[in-house]
Protein backbone atom coordinates (compact mmCIF):
# COMPACT_ATOMS: atom_id res chain seq x y z
CA UNK A 1 0.00 0.00 0.00
CA UNK A 2 1.45 3.44 -0.93
CA UNK A 3 2.46 5.62 2.05
CA UNK A 4 0.37 8.66 3.05
CA UNK A 5 3.14 10.21 5.16
CA UNK A 6 6.93 10.07 5.11
CA UNK A 7 9.74 10.17 7.64
CA UNK A 8 11.66 13.30 8.57
CA UNK A 9 13.90 14.54 5.72
CA UNK A 10 11.65 12.82 3.20
CA UNK A 11 8.77 14.01 1.00
CA UNK A 12 5.86 12.27 -0.67
CA UNK A 13 5.76 12.26 -4.47
CA UNK A 14 4.05 9.88 -6.89
CA UNK A 15 2.92 7.71 -3.96
CA UNK A 16 6.42 7.15 -2.68
CA UNK A 17 8.78 8.68 -0.15
CA UNK A 18 11.84 10.42 -1.56
CA UNK A 19 14.79 11.87 0.37
CA UNK A 20 14.95 15.64 0.61
CA UNK A 21 18.11 17.36 -0.60
CA UNK A 22 20.48 18.41 2.16
CA UNK A 23 21.22 22.10 2.88
CA UNK A 24 23.49 23.53 0.20
CA UNK A 25 21.96 21.36 -2.52
CA UNK A 26 18.95 21.68 -4.84
CA UNK A 27 16.64 19.08 -6.37
CA UNK A 28 17.43 17.88 -9.89
CA UNK A 29 15.07 14.90 -10.09
CA UNK A 30 12.71 13.06 -7.78
CA UNK A 31 13.47 9.51 -6.76
CA UNK A 32 11.79 6.62 -8.52
CA UNK A 33 11.17 3.01 -7.61
CA UNK A 34 14.71 2.31 -8.81
CA UNK A 35 16.70 5.54 -8.22
CA UNK A 36 17.53 7.89 -5.36
CA UNK A 37 16.64 11.57 -5.32
CA UNK A 38 19.15 13.47 -7.43
CA UNK A 39 20.55 16.67 -5.91
CA UNK A 40 23.16 19.18 -7.05
CA UNK A 41 25.24 21.65 -5.01
CA UNK A 42 24.21 25.30 -5.15
CA UNK A 43 26.39 27.46 -7.37
CA UNK A 44 28.67 30.32 -6.39
CA UNK A 45 26.77 33.08 -4.52
CA UNK A 46 23.79 30.76 -3.95
CA UNK A 47 22.47 28.92 -0.89
CA UNK A 48 19.74 26.72 0.57
CA UNK A 49 19.63 26.58 4.36
CA UNK A 50 17.18 23.71 4.93
CA UNK A 51 16.53 20.12 3.88
CA UNK A 52 14.53 20.84 0.76
CA UNK A 53 13.00 19.93 -2.60
CA UNK A 54 13.73 23.33 -4.19
CA UNK A 55 14.65 23.28 -7.87
CA UNK A 56 16.50 26.61 -7.59
CA UNK A 57 18.91 27.85 -4.94
CA UNK A 58 18.44 31.33 -3.47
CA UNK A 59 20.83 34.15 -4.35
CA UNK A 60 22.92 35.39 -1.46
CA UNK A 61 21.63 38.67 -0.08
CA UNK A 62 23.29 41.74 -1.60
CA UNK A 63 24.52 44.20 1.03
CA UNK A 64 23.74 47.35 -0.93
CA UNK A 65 26.16 50.18 -0.06
CA UNK A 66 23.53 52.63 -1.36
CA UNK A 67 21.45 51.54 1.63
CA UNK A 68 24.41 51.93 4.00
CA UNK A 69 24.98 48.16 4.18
CA UNK A 70 28.18 46.11 4.19
CA UNK A 71 28.94 42.40 4.52
CA UNK A 72 29.24 41.25 8.13
CA UNK A 73 29.47 37.55 7.28
CA UNK A 74 29.91 36.08 3.82
CA UNK A 75 27.35 33.48 2.81
CA UNK A 76 28.08 29.82 2.15
CA UNK A 77 26.15 27.20 0.18
CA UNK A 78 24.15 26.59 3.38
CA UNK A 79 23.86 30.10 4.80
CA UNK A 80 22.86 33.51 3.54
CA UNK A 81 25.11 36.55 3.67
CA UNK A 82 24.62 38.67 6.80
CA UNK A 83 24.65 42.44 6.30
CA UNK A 84 25.36 45.15 8.83
CA UNK A 85 25.54 48.95 8.71
CA UNK A 86 28.52 50.96 7.58
CA UNK A 87 30.32 52.97 10.27
CA UNK A 88 28.22 56.03 11.11
CA UNK A 89 24.96 54.39 10.02
CA UNK A 90 22.29 52.42 11.92
CA UNK A 91 19.62 49.84 11.02
CA UNK A 92 16.06 50.96 10.31
CA UNK A 93 14.69 47.82 12.00
CA UNK A 94 15.81 44.71 13.89
CA UNK A 95 16.09 42.80 10.61
CA UNK A 96 18.53 45.43 9.32
CA UNK A 97 17.39 45.44 5.68
CA UNK A 98 18.61 49.01 5.26
CA UNK A 99 20.52 51.68 7.18
CA UNK A 100 20.42 55.45 7.54
CA UNK A 101 23.06 57.95 8.60
CA UNK A 102 23.13 58.71 12.30
CA UNK A 103 21.14 61.82 13.13
CA UNK A 104 23.04 64.92 14.25
CA UNK A 105 21.82 67.03 17.16
CA UNK A 106 21.08 70.59 16.02
CA UNK A 107 22.43 73.72 17.73
CA UNK A 108 20.61 74.08 21.05
CA UNK A 109 20.62 70.31 21.49
CA UNK A 110 23.35 68.00 22.75
CA UNK A 111 23.97 64.28 22.40
CA UNK A 112 22.38 62.36 25.27
CA UNK A 113 23.31 58.95 23.82
CA UNK A 114 25.72 58.28 20.96
CA UNK A 115 24.28 56.13 18.16
CA UNK A 116 25.16 52.46 17.72
CA UNK A 117 24.72 50.10 14.78
CA UNK A 118 21.14 49.44 15.86
CA UNK A 119 20.03 52.69 17.50
CA UNK A 120 20.07 56.32 16.45
CA UNK A 121 21.59 59.31 18.23
CA UNK A 122 19.44 60.51 21.13
CA UNK A 123 19.42 64.30 21.48
CA UNK A 124 18.36 66.41 24.44
CA UNK A 125 17.69 70.16 24.68
CA UNK A 126 20.49 72.07 26.38
CA UNK A 127 19.19 73.15 29.81
CA UNK A 128 19.74 76.59 31.28
CA UNK A 129 23.46 77.02 31.93
CA UNK A 130 24.46 74.86 28.95
CA UNK A 131 24.77 75.40 25.19
CA UNK A 132 25.62 73.74 21.88
CA UNK A 133 26.48 75.88 18.85
CA UNK A 134 27.16 73.01 16.43
CA UNK A 135 25.24 70.28 14.63
CA UNK A 136 26.91 67.07 15.83
CA UNK A 137 26.34 63.37 16.39
CA UNK A 138 28.89 63.33 19.27
CA UNK A 139 28.96 66.67 21.11
CA UNK A 140 27.17 67.05 24.43
CA UNK A 141 25.83 70.38 25.71
CA UNK A 142 28.69 72.43 27.13
CA UNK A 143 28.39 74.47 30.34
CA UNK A 144 28.47 78.23 29.97
CA UNK A 145 31.84 79.74 30.74
CA UNK A 146 32.09 80.80 34.37
CA UNK A 147 33.15 84.45 34.09
CA UNK A 148 33.57 84.73 37.87
CA UNK A 149 36.36 82.15 38.03
CA UNK A 150 38.29 84.27 35.50
CA UNK A 151 37.69 87.42 37.49
CA UNK A 152 35.43 88.67 34.72
CA UNK A 153 31.75 89.60 34.46
CA UNK A 154 29.01 88.52 32.09
CA UNK A 155 28.71 91.07 29.30
CA UNK A 156 26.24 89.03 27.22
CA UNK A 157 23.97 86.33 28.57
CA UNK A 158 24.27 82.83 27.20
CA UNK A 159 21.48 80.91 25.41
CA UNK A 160 20.98 77.24 24.57
CA UNK A 161 22.96 77.95 21.36
CA UNK A 162 25.60 80.43 22.54
CA UNK A 163 28.08 80.74 25.37
CA UNK A 164 28.11 83.76 27.66
CA UNK A 165 30.41 86.59 26.68
CA UNK A 166 32.74 87.62 29.50
CA UNK A 167 34.35 91.02 29.89
CA UNK A 168 36.40 93.02 32.37
CA UNK A 169 34.71 94.39 35.45
CA UNK A 170 33.97 98.10 35.26
CA UNK A 171 36.45 99.82 37.63
CA UNK A 172 34.92 102.56 39.73
CA UNK A 173 36.77 105.83 39.07
CA UNK A 174 37.94 107.82 42.09
Amino acid sequence: EPPTACREKQYLINSQCCSLCQPGQKLVSDCTEFTETECLPCGESEFLDTWNRETHCHQHKYCDPNLGLRVQQKGTSETDTICTCEEGWHCTSEACESCVLHRSCSPGFGVKQIATGVSDTICEPCPVGFFSNVSSAFEKCHPWTSCETKDLVVQQAGTNKTDVVCGPQDRLRA
Epitope: D49, H56, H58, Q59, K61, N66, L67, G68, D80, T92, S93, E94, A95, E97, S98, V100, L101, H102, R103, D120
Partner: antibody
Framework: EVTVKESGPVLVKPTETLTLTCTVS????????VSWIRQPPGKALEWLGG???????YYASWAKSRLTISRDTNLKQVVLTMTNMDPVDTATYYC??????????WGQGTLVTVSS | AFQLTQSPSSLSASVGDRVTITCQAS??????LAWYQQKPGKPPKLLIV???NLASGVPSRFSGSGSGTDFTLTISSLQPEDFATYYC??????????FGGGTKVEIK
Protein backbone atom coordinates in the same frame (compact mmCIF):
# COMPACT_ATOMS: atom_id res chain seq x y z
CA GLU B 1 13.69 34.42 -10.86
CA VAL B 2 12.65 36.61 -7.94
CA THR B 3 8.89 37.23 -7.86
CA VAL B 4 6.11 38.19 -5.45
CA LYS B 5 2.44 37.61 -6.25
CA GLU B 6 -0.76 38.64 -4.49
CA SER B 7 -3.86 36.46 -4.38
CA GLY B 8 -7.22 36.65 -2.66
CA PRO B 9 -10.84 37.71 -3.14
CA VAL B 10 -11.68 40.51 -5.55
CA LEU B 11 -14.96 41.34 -3.83
CA VAL B 12 -15.55 41.72 -0.08
CA LYS B 13 -18.71 42.79 1.73
CA PRO B 14 -18.66 45.65 4.27
CA THR B 15 -17.80 44.51 7.85
CA GLU B 16 -16.18 41.32 6.49
CA THR B 17 -12.51 40.38 6.97
CA LEU B 18 -10.14 40.51 4.00
CA THR B 19 -7.45 37.84 3.72
CA LEU B 20 -4.75 38.30 1.08
CA THR B 21 -1.77 36.05 0.42
CA CYS B 22 1.60 37.04 -1.00
CA THR B 23 3.46 34.06 -2.46
CA VAL B 24 7.17 34.61 -3.06
CA SER B 25 9.73 32.74 -5.12
CA UNK B 26 13.46 33.03 -5.73
CA UNK B 27 14.22 34.18 -2.19
CA UNK B 28 13.77 33.07 1.38
CA UNK B 29 11.47 34.80 3.87
CA UNK B 30 14.23 34.20 6.41
CA UNK B 31 16.42 36.55 4.37
CA UNK B 32 13.96 39.24 3.26
CA UNK B 33 10.88 40.87 4.70
CA VAL B 34 7.62 41.52 2.86
CA SER B 35 5.40 44.59 3.10
CA TRP B 36 1.83 45.39 2.07
CA ILE B 37 0.99 48.66 0.32
CA ARG B 38 -2.38 49.69 -1.06
CA GLN B 39 -3.60 52.31 -3.52
CA PRO B 40 -7.24 53.42 -3.69
CA PRO B 41 -8.36 54.21 -7.30
CA GLY B 42 -6.83 57.50 -8.44
CA LYS B 43 -5.17 58.09 -5.07
CA ALA B 44 -1.74 57.83 -3.44
CA LEU B 45 0.15 54.78 -2.18
CA GLU B 46 -0.43 53.84 1.48
CA TRP B 47 1.96 51.65 3.46
CA LEU B 48 -0.08 49.20 5.56
CA GLY B 49 2.62 47.21 7.28
CA GLY B 50 5.21 44.54 6.83
CA UNK B 51 7.00 41.58 8.34
CA UNK B 52 10.78 41.57 8.71
CA UNK B 53 13.12 38.70 7.84
CA UNK B 54 13.33 38.07 11.60
CA UNK B 55 9.53 37.61 11.79
CA UNK B 56 8.81 40.96 13.49
CA UNK B 57 5.56 42.53 12.26
CA TYR B 58 5.16 46.28 11.78
CA TYR B 59 1.95 48.22 11.15
CA ALA B 60 0.97 51.72 10.09
CA SER B 61 -0.34 53.47 13.22
CA TRP B 62 -3.75 54.17 11.67
CA ALA B 63 -4.20 50.53 10.65
CA LYS B 64 -2.78 48.76 13.72
CA SER B 65 -6.14 47.80 15.23
CA ARG B 66 -7.42 46.17 12.02
CA LEU B 67 -4.35 44.48 10.57
CA THR B 68 -2.48 41.25 11.14
CA ILE B 69 0.50 40.19 9.04
CA SER B 70 1.92 36.70 9.40
CA ARG B 71 4.13 34.37 7.40
CA ASP B 72 4.81 30.73 6.65
CA THR B 73 8.45 30.40 5.62
CA ASN B 74 7.98 26.83 4.36
CA LEU B 75 5.02 27.71 2.14
CA LYS B 76 6.83 30.96 1.19
CA GLN B 77 3.72 32.95 1.97
CA VAL B 78 2.92 36.17 3.80
CA VAL B 79 -0.70 36.69 4.81
CA LEU B 80 -2.47 40.00 5.39
CA THR B 81 -5.77 40.02 7.27
CA MET B 82 -7.78 43.23 7.55
CA THR B 83 -10.92 43.23 9.67
CA ASN B 84 -14.13 45.28 9.39
CA MET B 85 -13.75 46.18 5.71
CA ASP B 86 -15.44 49.35 4.47
CA PRO B 87 -16.05 50.72 0.94
CA VAL B 88 -13.20 53.23 1.54
CA ASP B 89 -10.85 50.20 1.72
CA THR B 90 -11.47 49.56 -1.99
CA ALA B 91 -7.99 49.62 -3.49
CA THR B 92 -5.28 47.79 -5.37
CA TYR B 93 -3.31 45.87 -2.74
CA TYR B 94 0.37 45.26 -3.48
CA CYS B 95 2.92 43.12 -1.72
CA UNK B 96 6.58 44.08 -2.08
CA UNK B 97 9.85 42.51 -1.01
CA UNK B 98 11.28 44.22 2.08
CA UNK B 99 10.29 45.17 5.61
CA UNK B 100 11.34 48.62 6.87
CA UNK B 101 13.33 49.49 3.78
CA UNK B 102 12.90 50.43 0.12
CA UNK B 103 10.88 48.30 -2.29
CA UNK B 104 12.64 47.30 -5.49
CA UNK B 105 10.43 44.27 -6.16
CA TRP B 106 6.62 44.58 -6.32
CA GLY B 107 3.76 42.27 -7.24
CA GLN B 108 1.35 43.30 -9.98
CA GLY B 109 -1.28 44.09 -7.35
CA THR B 110 -4.80 42.81 -6.81
CA LEU B 111 -7.87 45.07 -6.92
CA VAL B 112 -10.15 44.49 -3.94
CA THR B 113 -13.63 46.03 -4.10
CA VAL B 114 -15.68 46.46 -0.92
CA SER B 115 -19.36 46.52 -1.74
CA SER B 116 -22.60 44.94 -0.61
CA ALA C 1 1.69 61.28 13.58
CA PHE C 2 4.59 61.32 11.14
CA GLN C 3 3.84 62.86 7.73
CA LEU C 4 5.52 63.29 4.35
CA THR C 5 4.31 66.30 2.37
CA GLN C 6 5.01 66.22 -1.35
CA SER C 7 4.72 69.23 -3.64
CA PRO C 8 3.47 70.13 -6.10
CA SER C 9 0.61 67.63 -6.38
CA SER C 10 0.77 68.02 -10.16
CA LEU C 11 2.78 69.93 -12.75
CA SER C 12 2.80 70.45 -16.51
CA ALA C 13 6.09 70.37 -18.36
CA SER C 14 7.55 69.90 -21.82
CA VAL C 15 10.11 67.42 -23.12
CA GLY C 16 13.58 68.74 -22.27
CA ASP C 17 12.42 70.71 -19.23
CA ARG C 18 14.13 70.50 -15.85
CA VAL C 19 11.63 69.27 -13.27
CA THR C 20 11.94 69.51 -9.48
CA ILE C 21 9.68 67.77 -6.93
CA THR C 22 10.04 68.28 -3.19
CA CYS C 23 9.22 66.13 -0.20
CA GLN C 24 9.15 67.40 3.38
CA ALA C 25 9.16 65.17 6.47
CA SER C 26 7.45 66.27 9.69
CA UNK C 27 10.55 65.15 11.61
CA UNK C 28 14.14 64.27 10.72
CA UNK C 29 14.53 61.00 8.82
CA UNK C 30 18.25 61.42 8.12
CA UNK C 31 18.88 59.80 4.70
CA UNK C 32 15.96 57.36 4.94
CA LEU C 33 14.09 58.48 1.83
CA ALA C 34 13.33 56.81 -1.50
CA TRP C 35 11.67 58.02 -4.72
CA TYR C 36 9.43 55.96 -7.04
CA GLN C 37 7.91 56.40 -10.48
CA GLN C 38 4.48 54.92 -11.24
CA LYS C 39 2.65 54.63 -14.54
CA PRO C 40 -1.10 53.85 -14.80
CA GLY C 41 -1.97 50.22 -14.09
CA LYS C 42 1.58 49.34 -13.06
CA PRO C 43 3.33 48.92 -9.70
CA PRO C 44 5.79 51.65 -8.69
CA LYS C 45 9.40 51.51 -9.87
CA LEU C 46 12.24 52.38 -7.48
CA LEU C 47 14.32 55.36 -8.65
CA ILE C 48 16.36 56.71 -5.71
CA VAL C 49 17.43 55.21 -2.37
CA UNK C 50 19.18 56.76 0.61
CA UNK C 51 17.92 60.21 -0.52
CA UNK C 52 20.52 60.60 -3.28
CA ASN C 53 21.62 57.20 -4.68
CA LEU C 54 20.35 56.04 -8.06
CA ALA C 55 18.69 52.60 -8.03
CA SER C 56 19.98 49.97 -10.44
CA GLY C 57 19.15 50.66 -14.11
CA VAL C 58 17.77 54.18 -13.54
CA PRO C 59 18.90 56.84 -16.09
CA SER C 60 21.31 59.49 -14.79
CA ARG C 61 18.89 62.34 -15.63
CA PHE C 62 17.20 61.45 -12.33
CA SER C 63 18.86 62.71 -9.16
CA GLY C 64 17.93 63.08 -5.52
CA SER C 65 19.22 65.33 -2.78
CA GLY C 66 18.51 66.28 0.81
CA SER C 67 18.84 65.00 4.35
CA GLY C 68 16.90 65.45 7.58
CA THR C 69 13.51 66.91 6.66
CA ASP C 70 13.84 68.39 3.16
CA PHE C 71 14.34 66.33 0.01
CA THR C 72 14.26 66.94 -3.74
CA LEU C 73 13.88 64.77 -6.85
CA THR C 74 15.18 66.39 -10.03
CA ILE C 75 14.75 65.26 -13.64
CA SER C 76 17.40 67.23 -15.53
CA SER C 77 15.87 66.89 -18.99
CA LEU C 78 12.36 65.45 -19.13
CA GLN C 79 11.87 62.61 -21.63
CA PRO C 80 8.54 61.36 -23.11
CA GLU C 81 8.72 58.20 -20.96
CA ASP C 82 9.05 60.29 -17.77
CA PHE C 83 5.43 61.46 -17.76
CA ALA C 84 4.12 59.59 -14.73
CA THR C 85 3.33 60.01 -11.03
CA TYR C 86 6.24 60.26 -8.57
CA TYR C 87 6.15 59.29 -4.88
CA CYS C 88 8.60 59.79 -2.05
CA UNK C 89 8.78 57.19 0.75
CA UNK C 90 10.46 57.38 4.14
CA UNK C 91 11.95 54.28 5.76
CA UNK C 92 13.76 55.74 8.77
CA UNK C 93 11.85 53.47 11.21
CA UNK C 94 8.62 51.48 11.42
CA UNK C 95 6.79 54.49 12.87
CA UNK C 96 7.92 56.68 9.98
CA UNK C 97 7.43 54.34 7.02
CA UNK C 98 5.07 56.38 4.87
CA PHE C 99 4.51 57.46 1.25
CA GLY C 100 4.07 61.06 0.12
CA GLY C 101 0.87 62.17 -1.62
CA GLY C 102 2.37 61.90 -5.11
CA THR C 103 3.21 64.35 -7.90
CA LYS C 104 1.65 63.86 -11.34
CA VAL C 105 3.92 65.06 -14.14
CA GLU C 106 1.80 65.86 -17.21
CA ILE C 107 2.56 67.03 -20.74
CA LYS C 108 2.21 70.79 -21.26
Amino acid sequence: EVTVKESGPVLVKPTETLTLTCTVSGFSLSSYGVSWIRQPPGKALEWLGGIGSDGSAYYASWAKSRLTISRDTNLKQVVLTMTNMDPVDTATYYCARGGITVYAMWGQGTLVTVSS
Amino acid sequence: AFQLTQSPSSLSASVGDRVTITCQASQSISTGLAWYQQKPGKPPKLLIVGASNLASGVPSRFSGSGSGTDFTLTISSLQPEDFATYYCQSYFSSSSTVFGGGTKVEIK
